[in-house]
Interface confidence: low
């Protein structure tokens, strides 16, 4: 059998083969960060020869070349330094404006290892036009210098660079340029996941919080794919499964799409998801016309059933047909609902195209996009009703021009991306829906991305302190109420001296709030059972604090979801008639439920809440605690059913100062408080002044560590009595 020669090494890099040395196999070179392969790939021909795309000779020596960033071609009304033909990775360029002009954008930009400049295009503007000066991105040339309404500017890139964004922009009546900023990039450049995730996520984040039906005041959440309360989102996921996509990469496409679906369903919006895989022909796995497209389990199931082999007979990339199947789906839905109806006109549509290459059959995909725009009546006033994201994966055969042509172009947004590999794609989808920037009081949203701060991960977490030292923790359960432990307040009632420290994006130290009123459970009395030889008793260890002002919702301050509320019901995506019992069954549904609390240093620590039979064995060790309970005959006198129990196995134990903090779980990418830290048999911070230092209890310790947390499912009457007009409670 014919095979291609194996003398294809790349100096300083590596290569992979899609199908070994056999004809049809694709050889893909890769280089360390900051270098790029030239050529990028070779194809094994049936003749047994390697063919290099766009090369004159069939075999050129493969080398890793240094990545460089494009130089400014022109910079208006200012100067830049240093002036080079192109810039090395790590090199800087600085911008300064002439008198009378204000610098907008980044005064200093650095060339990154992917051949892209960091920061934003620097523009020297004098505020003179109807639209702001649109600037000239690095490597671009602009024609047109009038910025009045109706004026147009055109861009082209200097040699060898590829333009992404809008080649032509028009100054619109609202003072905003049409389209999106053009960027000139090296053909070998790609996007880093950390840049793509926020850019992609921004468009979704506003949408996801915009339909929170329990929100009492209507706050404007700005643009992006904003769904009105009555509105609906159709999300179309198009997954390339052509021959050049390896089976493993196809699995990552699926997994990324699954992450996307999982997260988008975790928000209280009306959404239908279509799933289409495509190679030479499209295959519709789920249509928005199918009622199941609104059901997460059905959508995920249809994704799981997507098989790589579905397309083995047609291995081309027919992006036109994939987009055309979206068009046909839209057309059918329009016929069904009626073209003139609000039901049709208020649907917003988002298409996410995941591909590894350019379409090589079926005609121009742009035609299908034009049809889609026409059927949805996309004009300046209805621009928000369609977002097309074109995501190329693998630097190999992805066509920047085509992706750019397909992606939506909206001011201040990007819709076309190229990622280095499917691993990067997975990272993007994992982090793109960290929608912690929502301005309303949507509950239980924590930023899960790797680079988030502790406070961003648990934005409900607050510190409660008197004038002197920090004492307790608590959790925001609305924009003005904090849930904490009653025992924090047993020494003196002068709450005017206390402060609650809430997360604040502007300060690493947070923001201090005064307490308007403290509502301490009347049932709490630490000495209630002294006569029975129980020196301390923590029944009813629960309190509510009303802050003197409302907390401004931000990345660092947001309430956690309280079970048994409509807010939590929406976050759990449960049907409307759900009860408090249903929530308990869903959240505390195992003998051992993984949960978390927040440490003194702000990090999230892990525990396991023991339920049922395991609760009994967890609680029983209290009888070995002879100091606090010298003559205890019945453990249930101390550990009532108000308490959740943790501290077995590898559990962390809370420290003294962590009392009152939330005990919470994660479900569907949202966080739910099921308990609050109350008391325990072991203090891992004892004798340590360092917030970061915790000592594990020795294995021989008697009694072994155990921690008890007030179970919020057992405190419902009290919570409802005091929060009835703050939260919307479900029937018990």
């Amino acid at each position: 059998a014919t095979s291609c020669p194996q003398n294809v090494n790349i100096s300083g890099g590596t290569f992979t083969l899609s199908h070994g040395w056999a004809p049809g196999s694709l050889l893909i070179y890769s280089c360390p960060q900051g270098l790029y392969p030239s050529p990028a790939s070779r194809l094994c021909k049936s003749s047994g020869q390697w063919q290099t795309p766009r090369a004159t000779r069939s075999l050129t020596k493969a080398v890793c070349k240094p990545v460089r960033c494009p130089a400014p071609v022109s910079f208006e009304n200012g100067i830049y330094t240093p002036r080079l033909g192109s810039y090395p990775v790590g090199g800087n360029v600085s911008f300064e404006c002439e008198d009378g002009f204000i610098l907008r954008g980044s005064p200093v930009r650095q060339c990154r290892p992917n051949g892209m400049w960091d920061g934003e295009t620097a523009v020297c503007d004098n505020g003179a036009g109807h639209c702001p000066n649109p600037g000239i991105s690095l490597g671009a040339v602009r024609t047109g210098s009038r910025f009045g309404h109706g004026d147009k500017v055109r861009y082209r890139c200097s040699s060898n660079l590829v333009l992404t964004g809008s080649a032509e922009r028009e100054c619109q009546g609202n003072g905003v340029w049409s389209g999106t900023e053009p960027i000139c990039r090296q053909p070998y450049s790609y996007d880093f996941p950390e840049d793509v995730a926020p850019a992609l996520g921004t468009s979704f984040s506003h949408m996801l919080g915009a339909t929170n039906p329990t929100q009492r005041t209507k706050e404007s959440l700005g643009r992006k794919i904003q769904i009105q309360r009555s509105g609906h989102l159709n999300l179309y996921l198009l997954l390339d499964s052509s021959q050049s996509v390896s089976e493993n990469d196809f699995l990552i496409f699926k997994e990324s799409a699954s992450l996307m679906v999982d997260r988008i369903f975790s928000f209280e919006i009306n959404v239908s998801v279509a799933i289409i895989t495509f190679a030479s022909e499209p295959k519709v796995l789920m249509s928005v016309l199918n009622v199941n497209s609104r059901d997460i389990t059905e959508v995920i199931s249809s994704l799981e059933n997507a098989k790589y082999k579905d397309h083995e007979n047609g291995t081309g990339t027919n992006t036109y047909a994939a987009l055309n199947s979206v068009y046909l789906m839209m057309n059918n839905q329009m016929q069904l609902l009626g073209m003139k109806t609000m039901a049709w006109q208020e649907i917003r549509h988002a298409i996410i195209l995941l591909t590894d290459g350019k379409s090589n059959m079926g005609g121009s995909p742009k035609t299908a996009v034009d049809q889609i725009r026409e059927i949805l009546n996309i004009n300046q006033k209805r621009n928000d009703y369609l977002d097309i994201y074109a995501i190329g994966v693998g630097k190999l055969d992805v066509d920047w021009r085509e992706l750019n042509e397909l992606g939506s172009k909206k001011d201040g947004e990007r819709h076309a991306f190229i990622l280095q590999d499917t691993k990067a794609l997975h990272q993007v989808f994992e982090h793109m829906l960290d929608v912690s920037k929502l301005t309303d009081t949507i509950c239980g949203v924590g930023n899960m991305s790797a680079n988030a701060s502790d406070q961003e991960r648990t934005p409900w977490h607050v510190t409660i302190k008197p004038k002197s030292q920090e004492t307790c923790r608590g959790a925001l359960i609305s924009d003005q109420w904090v849930l904490t432990a009653a025992h924090c307040f047993r020494d003196g009632n002068d709450h005017s001296l206390w402060r609650v420290n809430v997360g604040d994006p502007k300060s690493q130290w947070g923001k201090e709030f005064l307490i308007e009123k403290a509502v301490i459970s009347p049932g709490f009395d630490v000495f209630a059972k002294k006569n029975q030889g129980i020196l301390e008793f923590y029944g009813d260890d629960i309190a509510l604090l009303k802050l003197a002002q409302k907390v401004k919702m931000s990345t660092h301050a947001r309430p956690i979801c309280l079970p048994c509320t409509m807010e939590a019901n929406l976050a759990l995506r449960r049907p409307q008639g759900s009860t408090c019992r249903d929530h308990e069954n869903e959240l505390l549904n195992k003998q051992s439920v993984p949960a978390h609390f927040v440490a003194l240093n702000g990090s999230k620590l892990n525990i396991n809440l023991k339920m049922g039979v395991e609760w009994t064995s967890c609680a029983e060790v209290v009888s070995q605690e002879k100091t606090m309970f010298p003559n205890l005959t019945d453990v249930r006198e101390v550990v009532t059913d108000q308490f959740l129990c943790s501290g077995t196995q590898e559990d962390e134990s809370p420290c003294k100062g962590e009392s009152g903090g939330a005990v919470f779980l994660e479900r569907r990418f949202r966080f739910f408080q099921v308990g609050l830290v109350s008391w325990g048999l072991y203090n891992p911070c004892l004798g340590s002044a360092d917030k970061n230092s915790r000592k594990r209890a020795p294995r021989s310790k008697v009694p072994p560590p155990r921690d008890f947390h007030i179970n919020l499912f057992r405190m419902q009457p009290w919570l409802r009595q005091h929060l009835g007009d703050v939260l919307n409670f479900l029937p018990l």
Epitope: I102, N126, A128, H130, H149, G173
Partner: antibody, heavy 125, light 106 residues
Framework: QVQLQQSGPGLVKPSQPLSLTCAIS??????????WSWIRQSPSRGLEWLGR?????????DYAVFVKSRMTINPDTSKNQFSLQLNSVTPEDTAVYYC???????????????WGQGILVTVSS | SYELTQPPSLSVSPGQTASITCSGH??????ACWYQQKPGQSPVLVIY???KRPSGIPERFSGSNSGNTATLTISGTQALDEADYYC?????????FGTGTKVTVL
């Protein structure tokens, strides 16, 4: 409450410079969100914007085309005021001169929300 | 240069509606604002961003702006509304004022 108090001579001889000052209270001349303009009004030419100064990490000055060559606006942060100097005046420059606070057109604020009391300046020998 | 044209004068009976127009090329694509000026006084902003009213300005003042024309409407005109009214817009590095309209309340 922002107030603008103007001062300067009411009579200027032809070819001499015209100098006016506008003292600001209730805001700062180096505010990042305001612009400070001079406007004049005469029966023959109506209201005319002459120029402005504003601070956005450094000072900026813009002037109307018809006075650009002979006009200067200077901010004085120590006294929280800004001044106008119009050189080589002619009887054509006779008008009521106003100082006013405005915003940047780019921030959708191309209007003046506070005006000084106005000073009638007569150019005559 | 950009010009804004207003009718020189307008007479209105008390309680009636006065509509003052301001014309300029594609004015609807710019923000228009209006000032009221009484004899011997400085101009006072009565409408900005086409149709917004600063605090302290009575509700009888309203504005609109589309096409080539911005309009200031005074409904239920009162004697104290007698004054000169000027429109103003921003056009390429300059603030442009209208020619002014003298409103007389009969």
């Amino acid at each position: 409450q922002v107030q603008l108090q103007q001062s300067g001579p009411g009579l200027v001889k032809p070819s001499q410079p015209l100098s006016l000052t506008c003292a600001i209270s209730g805001d700062s001349v180096s505010s990042n969100s305001a612009t400070w303009s001079w406007i004049r009004q005469s029966p023959s030419r109506g209201l005319e914007w002459l120029g402005r100064t504003y601070y956005r990490s450094k000072w900026y000055h813009d002037y109307a085309v018809f006075v650009k060559s002979r006009m200067t606006i200077n901010p004085d942060t120590s006294k929280n005021q800004f001044s106008l100097q119009l050189n080589s005046v002619t009887p054509e420059d006779t008008a009521v001169y106003y100082c006013a606070r405005g915003g940047m057109p780019a921030s959708d604020i191309p209007h003046f929300d506070n005006w000084g009391q106005g000073i009638l300046v007569t150019v005559s020998s | 240069s950009y010009e804004l044209t207003q009718p020189p004068s307008l007479s209105v009976s008390p309680g009636q509606t006065a509509s003052i127009t301001c014309s300029g090329h594609k004015l609807g694509d710019k923000y228009a604002c209006w000032y009221q000026q009484k004899p011997g006084q400085s101009p006072v902003l009565v409408i900005y961003q086409d149709n917004k009213r600063p605090s302290g300005i009575p509700e009888r003042f309203s504005g609109s702006n589309s096409g080539n024309t911005a309009t200031l409407t005074i409904s239920g005109t009162q004697a104290l509304d007698e004054a000169d009214y000027y429109c103003q817009a921003w056009d390429s590095i300059t603030y442009v004022f209208g020619t002014g309209t003298k409103v007389t309340v009969l």
